[in-house]
């Protein structure tokens, strides 16, 4: 069976197909979750949709083989198998990993440590997001690009305010926050 | 008529390896999922591994994942069960099943006992 | 995993009498995706009933099975001398497929 991987935002309507045509005159054709767990099964001229977690919000489109879901959530993260039961009695299958993400929300940038050293303002921020496994990516008047959730900087004696945007993002969104200071070692904005 | 006939069980040591065979007729193979059922001595039924009919995907109950490999050839007509690491409550009669259309097993083929002690 | 549970254990019984089985599911079962099986001493299991209802090929109408939801019953209309058996039940609602421990139908 050939593997294909899918990331979408949930919440979002989700076509899963195959990018090849189906065999000619298939006998049957059923979508599964799981191994054996059926969405619906086409035979015999009729769809029959399956008491599941799917039920109503799905939809089988017989001639491509394209399974169509409605609003779909984090619960919904599974490895789906199109199974098709050939003219010659023999069975070819698909299968589409479907990764469901959040969107990102809004980080916090918090202030860890921020003190004058030598006329130097020393700041140590954090970009916090509850519980996601996201990238995180610092822009800004910084040295190089930093991609942690932390970012540790030092700056010199400046007349402007600097400002640093931490980008979180995952495969589906991204989110921006922004902290500024204001000379010599003051947090003005976010 | 549908036949299923297993092979290949017998007396093992703790630790040691096994392969068992099922040889199917009367139908086409290769339409049809496939499932290995074990029993242990006076106890009940055990659902152990299926497979797919195109042999693209397998599952395994909890007890048996990582030591026990379903595999099949459609070419043969043949299902296979290789064990490993072999444990005394592995001790059954293995029986093979078609897995009609991913609901229930049948038929049943006879089953083949593996016994394993030192 | 929904686990099943068979009661009785074990019946005697005498041939021509009636006989109810019964299999509860510790979850709803799925559209009755409920399955019975005989098995004679020696013997591989046999598909009696598929659906909760519907009687596998050549299985003869005194067996018949009922239920829907947790609460499922096989139910032999006039035992016949072979159908003293171990019957078991299974799902397939949910994964894993899973069986009951099984109810003995035994002469008494």
């Known amino acids: 069976g050939r593997l294909v991987h899918m990331t979408v935002v949930s919440g979002s309507n989700v076509t899963l197909n195959i990018s090849e045509s189906l065999p000619e005159n298939y006998k049957q054709l059923t979508w599964f979750y799981t191994f054996d767990q059926k969405i619906v099964e086409w035979d015999s001229g009729k769809s029959k949709y399956f008491e599941s977690k799917f039920k109503g919000r799905v939809r089988l489109d017989p001639q491509s083989g394209a399974l169509y879901i409605s609003k779909v959530q984090k619960e919904d993260n599974s490895t789906y198998v199109m199974r098709v039961l050939k003219k010659d009695g023999y069975e070819q299958e698909w299968k589409i990993k479907l990764q469901v993400l959040d969107p990102v929300p809004k980080p916090v940038i918090k202030i860890e440590k921020r003190e004058d050293v030598d006329d130097n303002c020393y700041l140590k921020l954090s970009c916090v997001i509850p519980g996601e496994s996201v990238n995180y990516t610092w822009y800004g008047e910084l040295p190089k690009e930093i991609q942690n959730s932390v970012l540790e900087t030092t700056l010199k004696p400046h007349k402007h305010s600097r400002c640093y945007t931490c980008q979180v993002s995952n495969s589906v969104s991204s989110k921006n926050g922004t902290f500024c200071f204001s000379p010599p070692c003051t947090a003005a904005r976010s | 008529e549908v036949q299923l006939l297993e092979s290949g069980g017998g007396l093992v040591h703790p630790g040691g390896s096994l392969r068992l065979s099922c040889a199917a007729s009367?139908?086409?193979?290769?339409?049809?999922?496939m499932s290995w059922v074990r029993q242990a001595p006076g106890k009940g039924l055990e659902w152990v591994s299926l497979?797919?009919?195109?042999?693209?995907?397998?599952y395994y109950a909890d007890s048996v994942k990582g030591r026990f490999t379903i595999f099949r050839d459609n070419s043969k007509n043949t299902l296979y069960l290789q064990m490993i690491s072999l444990r005394a409550e592995d001790s059954a009669v293995y029986y093979c099943?078609?897995?009609?259309?991913?609901?229930?097993?049948?038929?049943w083929g006879q089953g083949t006992l593996v016994t394993v002690s030192s | 995993e929904i686990v099943l549970t068979q009661s009785p254990g074990t019946l005697s019984l005498s041939p021509g009498e009636r006989v109810t089985l019964s299999c509860r599911a510790s979850?709803?079962?799925?559209?009755?995706?409920l399955a019975w099986y005989q098995q004679k001493p020696g013997q591989a299991p046999r598909l009696l009933i598929y659906g909760a209802s519907s009687r596998a090929t050549g299985i003869p109408d005194r067996f018949s099975g009922s239920g829907s939801g947790t609460d499922f019953t096989l139910t032999i209309s006039r035992l016949e001398p072979e159908d003293f058996a171990v019957y078991y039940c299974?799902?397939?609602?949910?994964?894993?497929?899973?069986f009951g421990q099984g109810t003995k139908v035994e002469i008494k």
């Open positions: 497979i797919s009919g195109s042999g693209g995907s397998t």
């Open positions: 099943a078609k897995y009609s259309n991913y609901d229930y097993f049948d038929p």
């Open positions: 009367g139908f086409t193979f290769g339409g049809y999922a």
């Open positions: 979850q709803s079962v799925s559209s009755s995706y």
């Open positions: 299974q799902q397939y609602g949910s994964s894993p497929r899973t």
